[in-house]
Interface confidence: medium
């Protein structure tokens, strides 16, 4: 019996297919062949289906980089890992996705989902559109949507100081942010760590975090592979 | 244009009530937080509540925590402010004000207000 | 909650005049400030948005600056229109609190 989905365009399509163990995938943009991406599926959370673009969990990676670095990705999709607004772009393209955000702390966990997710094109400095919030760590996003992409060397903010090199990190900050999972690790001083403002404050940097995409239509997608 | 209009105010006995509302027009309602902020006179400004557009998400100063509800009604563009067990120090000038788009804490647009005096 | 402490309280200036009225935040609050201006009798008006953004139709002689605990509004040359009380206000966090305002008046 062949695929359903030959050329997987995310890790919902993957699971379509019957794969329902989360891990590295190839997915291929538009459905394109030439275009190959090699991504982590999140195959559990929240019926699975979820390509993971953020992770951090030990301070390994070091996630103070430039705007070319953050543009392409960098990091293991196993550990710690950015996988690059590049290719979040050209995923966000394909169909309307949701973002889901997932935090851990000592035994403690909190969730953000917003059903409309897009990031721009490198001509908009890869706008961040984010809508439709449900979940238990608080709505922190909100406050970055329609914000384009700062790092260091490239300060997109609304600030007179440039946030990213002010919080040692990169985010579409505006000035300067409630949501800075890209900081520094571990880092408690105000607003310098990995932070949710709107779950541990500013003062506090999270242990564990991951971003993650998928189609906003997955629920009925799945639904049908299941009657057929 | 963007406006908002207050009505409902008055003078009122301490211990009674009173229910604020405010009309919005020229944009779209659920999108943006809303809130009140009252100055009492001759005083400073000082935020009372707030609202999520959505409305699932309300806020209070403690100065009013338990006494006041704040309210939406998208379907009629409107804002409310229920006010019990009302005290002489309630006594203001309540504004309605429209959060900018985002988190919504920062008020781009306010109505003219509309006066609560609490007396006996 | 967030203290806001704002001086002076009075500033009697010359019309043409700098002004410069500064607001102290208890708390750091990175730049979730914002500025207003208020006409007796009337509404506040928002003139500065996180800390040093120009709200729409608000003259250039206008600016903010400052982050952390630290913020300042200029006004660089002072107009008759411009005599008016000054609040600065933190978004930072809820409640969202006020300075007790600037009176500037006539010297």
């Known amino acids: 019996i062949g695929l359903l989905y030959p050329f997987p365009r995310d890790c919902s399509q993957a699971m379509l297919n019957g794969d329902t163990t989360s891990g590295l995938y190839t997915i291929y943009i538009n459905g394109d062949k030439t275009q190959a991406l090699e991504v982590y599926c999140d195959m559990t959370s929240d019926g699975g289906g979820w390509i993971v673009f953020l992770r951090r969990k030990n301070g390994r990676e070091d996630f103070y980089r430039n705007w070319k670095a953050y543009a392409a990705g960098f990091g293991d999709r196993r550990e710690e890992f950015w996988l690059g607004l590049d290719n979040l772009s050209k995923i966000t393209a394909q169909g309307q996705y949701e973002l889901r955000v997932d935090l851990q702390d000592h035994g403690e966990s909190a969730y953000a989902v917003y059903d409309r997710f897009s990031v721009g094109d490198a001509k908009s400095r890869y706008k961040l559109k984010v809508e439709g919030y449900s979940g238990t760590a608080g709505d922190s996003m909100n406050y970055h949507n329609g914000r384009s992409f700062s790092t260091y060397d490239k300060d997109t903010d609304s600030a007179i100081t440039n946030c990213a090199l002010s919080y040692k990190g990169a985010f579409w900050y505006k000035n300067c942010h409630r949501v800075n999972l890209m900081g520094r690790y571990g880092d408690n001083n105000h607003s310098q760590g990995v932070n949710w403002f709107h779950w541990k404050g500013h003062e506090y940097s999270i242990q564990f975090a991951e971003m993650k995409l998928r189609p906003s239509n997955f629920r009925n997608l799945e639904g049908r592979r299941k009657r057929a | 244009q963007v406006q908002l209009v207050e009505s409902g105010g008055g003078l009122v006995q301490p211990g009674r009530s009173l229910r604020l509302s405010c009309a919005a027009s020229g944009f779209t309602f659920d999108d943006y937080a809303m809130h009140w902020v009252r100055q009492a006179p001759g005083k400073g400004l000082e935020w009372v509540s707030g609202i999520s557009g959505s409305g699932g998400s309300t806020y209070y100063a403690d100065s009013v925590k338990g006494r006041f509800t704040i309210s939406r009604d998208n379907a009629k563009n409107s804002l409310y402010l229920q006010m019990n067990s009302l005290r002489a120090e309630d006594t203001a000038l309540y504004y309605c004000?429209?959060?900018?788009?985002?988190?919504?804490?920062?008020?781009?647009?306010w109505g003219q207000g509309t006066m609560v005096t609490v007396s006996s | 909650d967030i203290q806001m402490t704002q001086s002076p309280a009075s500033l009697p200036t010359p019309v043409g005049d700098r002004v410069t009225i500064t607001c102290r935040a208890s708390q750091y609050i990175q730049g979730f400030l914002n500025w207003y201006q208020q006409k007796p009798g009337k509404a506040p008006k928002l003139l500065i948005y996180d800390a040093s953004n120009l709200e729409t139709g608000v003259p250039s002689r206008f600016s903010g600056s400052g982050s952390g605990t630290d913020f300042t509004l200029t006004i660089s040359s002072l107009q008759p229109e411009d005599f008016a009380t000054y609040y600065c206000?933190?978004?930072?966090?809820?409640?969202?609190?006020f300075g007790q305002g600037t009176k500037v008046d006539i010297k």
């Open positions: 206000q933190q978004s930072y966090s809820t409640p969202q609190t």
């Open positions: 004000a429209k959060g900018q788009k985002g988190e919504g804490d920062t008020f781009d647009i």
